[in-house]
């Protein structure tokens, strides 16, 4: 999978005023990383990993940022001659890849009220805006806007691909990302299903980097796809992932199942708890 | 029967303050975002400010840095602080539930209000 930084950020107008404050977060590498703290109008790290990203340098430079993003963001917002009444939100995320053979991605998309309504490529600089008429509308609003100073406008999606690239790097740079490994918590628990099978759920949790294969097991043998159903492999809020998967067996067979899971060139496998044990949990 | 109240409006000096109520009777605003509006003679309504259930509120560029909108859900009542009241602000103040909805305004039952008037 590619390294990427994608930011996300919010603005909000009621009743035709735009409101002052935005909402912002940061991921790196598809991890909740950075996100900005209206209290005290500052970035904050989102947990350890994220503060070990930076070590002991501030967050000042972050901090810039995402408040000239913000204001930026609150001025197209006042461009956008919607509807007027009650609340509405304007929301720009902002997307930066380096791939593995070192080639870059970069992109802008714009949501009104939630939907998505105009999208840049930002190194080709090429638009692409949805069929509905709402979408049009509000994506000649805000390209007038961004292009009514035509040279200024060039520049300043040059420096956006950059400055996300360049930040991309500088957080790789510290090698944490890199290098970081967590290894999964295994975790598996049965349940009555219909008369005579149970349903087996593995549970693999706070693990780092998200690619991970787990699978049943049948004497040694992984079942067939179609007999397993996989969760999604979702960030569980702590710069780690998590993710499950389970299969119905024949209640009396649990001894000839196991649940493989390999992660980051270690493996374990981790057998079917006995009706009297509820769960067993292991980390390997 | 299901209503909004509007009461504290009367005549100030610019600069001055007034404290305006919302309050409900016939049901519990604990769970409702509710807002201000006002009219003045031959103008359109405008919204003033809006409070959240959870307490997030938001104001009009008119009004920002000089009212305040609070709730106390014990007394089922909403509050608006006016201060360094202008000319400008003069006009019928009423109060209506779901402020943050794109219709909440056009399509708010108009109680009775409470004037509002800013004159030396």
């Known amino acids: 999978e590619p390294h990427s930084l994608r930011y996300n950020l919010t603005v909000l107008s009621w009743d035709g005023s735009v409101q002052s404050g935005f909402l912002a977060e940061v991921h790196l590498d598809g991890q909740p990383f950075l996100r900005y703290d209206r209290q005290k109008c500052r970035a904050k790290p989102q947990g350890q990993w994220a503060e070990d990203v930076l070590g002991n340098k501030t967050w000042d430079r972050e901090t810039r940022d995402l408040t000239g993003n913000g204001k930026d963001l609150r001025m197209t917002l006042a461009h956008i001659k919607d509807q007027k009444e009650g609340l509405h939100s304007l929301q720009e995320i902002r997307v930066c890849e380096i791939h593995e053979d070192n080639s870059t991605r970069s992109s802008q998309h714009f949501y009104y009220d939630g939907e998505l309504f105009l999208s840049q490529n930002l190194e080709t600089e090429e638009w692409t805006v949805p069929q509905s008429s709402r979408a049009q509308t509000l994506a000649m609003n805000v390209r007038n806007f961004l292009k009514e100073d035509a040279m200024k406008t060039k520049t300043h999606y040059h420096a956006m691909h950059a400055d996300c690239l360049q930040e991309l790097r500088r957080y790789l740079e510290s090698g944490v990302v890199l290098r970081r490994t967590v290894p999964p918590m295994v975790n598996v628990t049965r349940s009555e299903a219909s008369e005579g099978n149970i349903t087996v759920t593995c549970r693999a949790s706070s693990f780092y980097p998200r690619n991970i294969i787990l699978t049943w097991r049948q004497d040694g043998v992984s079942l067939s796809h179609d007999t397993q159903q996989w969760g999604d492999v979702l960030p569980d809020g702590n710069g780690t992932y998590q993710t499950w998967v389970a299969t119905r067996i024949c209640r009396g067979e649990e001894q000839r199942f196991t649940c493989y899971m390999e992660h980051s060139g270690n493996h374990s496998t981790h057998p079917v708890p006995s009706g009297k044990v509820l769960v067993l949990q292991s980390h390997w | 029967q299901v209503q909004l109240v509007e009461t504290g409006g009367g005549l100030v000096q610019p600069g001055g303050s007034l404290r305006l109520s919302c309050a409900a009777s016939g049901f519990t605003l604990d769970y409702y975002a509710i807002g201000w509006f006002r009219q003045a003679p031959g103008k359109e309504r405008e919204g003033v400010s809006c409070?959240?259930?959870?307490?997030?509120?938001y104001y009009a560029d008119s009004v920002k840095g000089r009212f305040t909108i609070s709730r106390d859900n014990a007394k089922n009542t909403v509050y608006l602080q006016m201060n360094s009241l202008k000319p400008e602000d003069t006009a019928v103040y009423y109060c209506?539930?779901?402020?943050?909805?794109?219709?909440?305004?056009?399509?708010?039952?108009l109680g009775q209000g409470t004037q509002v008037t800013v004159s030396s």
């Open positions: 209506a539930a779901d402020c943050l909805s794109s219709t909440w305004r056009t399509n708010a039952y």
């Open positions: 409070i959240t259930s959870d307490g997030n509120t």
